[in-house]
């Protein structure tokens, strides 16, 4: 239904608080370098304008699209050219090209300082002094560092952030109350950001069909009792929501997400028996809860798929009549029967089925040709099963830190051209699959592990896309969304790589390492490990382990020394020499 004023429509639907928060997120995700105060000023101006449109939808400029209004506002920033360079050229374009231009300049790895957490008392004072500014600052800092963060979900995080401060700033031991909550929000936030980044990459790089296929598979696993028509409706609506959010249309996205949650709760009897608790919660919690809801139980009796998808004489007829609908039904039927498979595996099976039908429905005897199609699934199913089994055994044997190190070595040898910080970040996240998924029973391991790996490898893909250095990474990232993980798994040592020149400075450490947290110290050691492999890609596991053990002993010894800095200088030289000898550098 058309509205005279889109901005008035969204302001009324969302309410002033959510409207302002979402506009702030949108602006911070586009202009990631702008100071907080500048964004607040822009948001206030947009909000005042929206209020005039609510009062009179026929007022001047109220009929303009949100992209036009927001784009015009962003283009008033005085320092656009100095701060953003060529992004300023976007302002010379007309909509919709201008918005597309802004989207293309979103930076997944903006050059922003690390967020340092102040002392608890300092944070509590700031919270009490000006709660509204404090919470806006949170939205701003997260949004500018995560330009694809799912905006309505960020509102949910902000609500929890506020609740944590409200509760803990009046607790007897503020730090004991607050810090674990902030750690949890940080970790969940990073995970949420990465999951949404994959959804946006799926839509933007592989198109709506790819995203819809993913959604059919996931929702069919989650709602196995729902009929295909119901799942299809949810997929269509969900695709619209994510297309909007990934496209920067945050007001429409939040509004449509709320409508979808409302629809799901009104129709839960025909969707899932697991939604009852979610649907009793307030809006933001409700939407989050639905997105995370556990899989419903499968219907007690489901027939084998062979009858409809292999044995029926109408397979090719049904396929030809509506290819995507027929393949969608296949994916739905397969996924609702297999909550134990990863979504990407289900999509590989559907792709194999599609390829077989394309070939066989043009053959002389189609049925004879596709009769054994299900047998082709066997290696596709067994490959991730075996990989997960092997890696969980390795994880259980090594523990998380050493498992991450094994992956660091593995991936540095595969793609040594990738920057060291990216290899460390991605390999550390890959290594977290162990503690995240290996504890699960067999039936939950694959969906946990392989779908998580898809999220992490997408981080590698988006970071690499910004500064491409490896044809192998580009190939694995762009050829097939669902085969990214098998593509990376299949990479062997890059024999074309010319080892990096040895630079002693890379392996020079100072006393400041002693005051770092355990996590930061691990990252320092893992950075050194990647550099070692880049210098000596043919080094054996044993050689690398010996050097890393010596390095750990060196750090421990010097951190206990009275004159730490002298120890690091003198012992460091010895360590570098010994390491060079051990690795034959």
């Amino acid at each position: 239904d058309a509205h005279k004023s889109e901005v008035a429509h969204r302001f009324k639907d969302l309410g002033e608080e959510n409207f302002k928060a979402l506009v702030l997120i949108a602006f911070a995700q586009y202009l990631q370098q702008c100071p907080f105060e500048d964004h607040v000023k822009l948001v206030n101006e947009v909000t005042e304008f929206a209020k005039t449109c609510v009062a009179d939808e026929s007022a001047e400029n109220c009929d303009k699209s949100l992209h036009t209004l927001f784009g015009d506002k962003l283009c008033t920033v005085a320092t656009l050219r100095e701060t953003y360079g060529e992004m300023a050229d976007c302002c010379a374009k007309q909509e919709p090209e201008r918005n597309e231009c802004f989207l293309q300049h979103k930076d997944d790895n903006p050059n922003l300082p690390r967020l340092v957490r102040p002392e608890v008392d300092v944070m509590c004072t700031a919270f009490h002094d000006n709660e509204e500014t404090f919470l806006k600052k949170y939205l701003y800092e997260i949004a500018r560092r995560h330009p694809y963060f799912y905006a309505p979900e960020l509102l949910f995080f902000a609500k929890r952030y506020k609740a944590a401060f409200t509760e803990c700033c009046q607790a007897a031991d503020k730090a004991a109350c607050l810090l674990p909550k902030l750690d949890e929000l940080r970790d969940e936030g990073k995970a949420s950001s990465a999951k949404q980044r994959l959804k946006c990459a799926s839509l933007q790089k592989f198109g709506e069909r790819a995203f819809k296929a993913w959604a059919v598979a996931r929702l069919s696993q989650r709602f196995p009792k729902a009929e295909f028509a119901e799942v299809s409706k949810l997929v269509t609506d969900l695709t619209k929501v994510h297309t909007e959010c990934c496209h920067g249309d945050l007001l429409e996205c939040a509004d449509d997400r709320a409508d979808l949650a409302k629809y799901i709760c009104e129709n839960q009897d025909s969707i899932s028996s697991k939604l009852k608790e979610c649907c009793e919660k307030p809006l933001l919690e409700k939407s989050h809860c639905i997105a995370e809801v556990e899989n419903d139980e499968m219907p007690a009796d489901l027939p084998s798929l062979a009858a409809d998808f292999v044995e029926s004489k109408d397979v090719c007829k049904n396929y030809a009549e509506a290819k995507d609908v027929f393949l969608g039904m296949f994916l739905y039927e397969y996924a609702r029967r297999h909550p134990d498979y990863s979504v990407v595996l289900l999509l590989r099976l559907a792709k194999t089925y599609e390829t077989t039908l394309e070939k066989c429905c043009a053959a002389a005897d189609p049925h004879e040709c596709y009769a054994k199609v299900f047998d082709e699934f066997k290696p596709l199913v067994e490959e991730p099963q075996n990989l997960i089994k092997q890696n969980c055994e390795l994880f259980e044997q090594l523990g998380e830190y050493k498992f991450q190190n094994a992956l660091l070595v593995r991936y540095t040898k595969k793609v040594p051209q990738v920057s060291t910080p990216t290899l460390v970040e991605v390999s550390r996240n890959l290594g977290k699959v162990g503690s995240k998924c290996c504890k699960h029973p067999e039936a939950k391991r694959m969906p946990c592990a392989e779908d998580y790996l898809s999220v992490v490898l997408n981080q590698l893909c988006v970071l690499h896309e910004k500064t491409p250095v490896s044809d192998r990474v580009t190939k694995c990232c762009t050829e097939s969304l669902v085969n990214r993980r098998p593509c990376f798994s299949a990479l062997e040592v890059d024999e074309t790589y010319v080892p990096k020149e040895f630079n002693a400075e890379t392996f020079t450490f100072h006393a400041d390492i002693c005051t770092l947290s355990e996590k930061e110290r691990q990252i320092k050691k893992q950075t050194a490990l990647v550099e070692l492999v880049k210098h000596k890609p043919k080094a054996t596991k044993e050689q690398l382990k010996a050097v890393m053990d010596d390095f750990a002993a060196f750090v421990e010894k010097c951190c206990k020394a009275d004159d730490k800095e002298t120890c690091f200088a003198e012992e460091g030289k010895k360590l570098v020499a010994a390491s060079q000898a051990a690795l034959g550098l």
Epitope: D301, Y334, R337, Y341, K378
Partner: nanobody, 123 residues
Framework: DVQLVESGGGLVQAGGSLRLSCAAS????????MGWFRQAPGKERERVVS????????YYADSVKGRFTISRDNAENTVYLQMNSLKPEDTAVYYC????????????????WGQGTLVTVSS
Amino acid sequence: DVQLVESGGGLVQAGGSLRLSCAASGLTFSSYAMGWFRQAPGKERERVVSISRGGGYTYYADSVKGRFTISRDNAENTVYLQMNSLKPEDTAVYYCAAARYWATGSEYEFDYWGQGTLVTVSS
């Protein structure tokens, strides 16, 4: 520990009948689809028949349709395979298998397997 124990195999003349049983323990039987597979000497293991968790749906390989019947008794934790009009080419080791999740009845979907029972059909 999960155990599937087959029984009822043996030597039978062509045209005769046999009834195989598979007793399951260590799992929630009604949560598993059950299947019978067979492997003839020198050949690959092939699926013969499967039955859904509640017993409402069955799947038969073309080679046994109309001759073999699968049934299950969830109260007794047992699945049965009634084999009529047996042929020499039915000679094989018959394996009972259980699948927590079942879409195609293919071998890779089955989580637990019995040791097998030999069926020999003489001409």
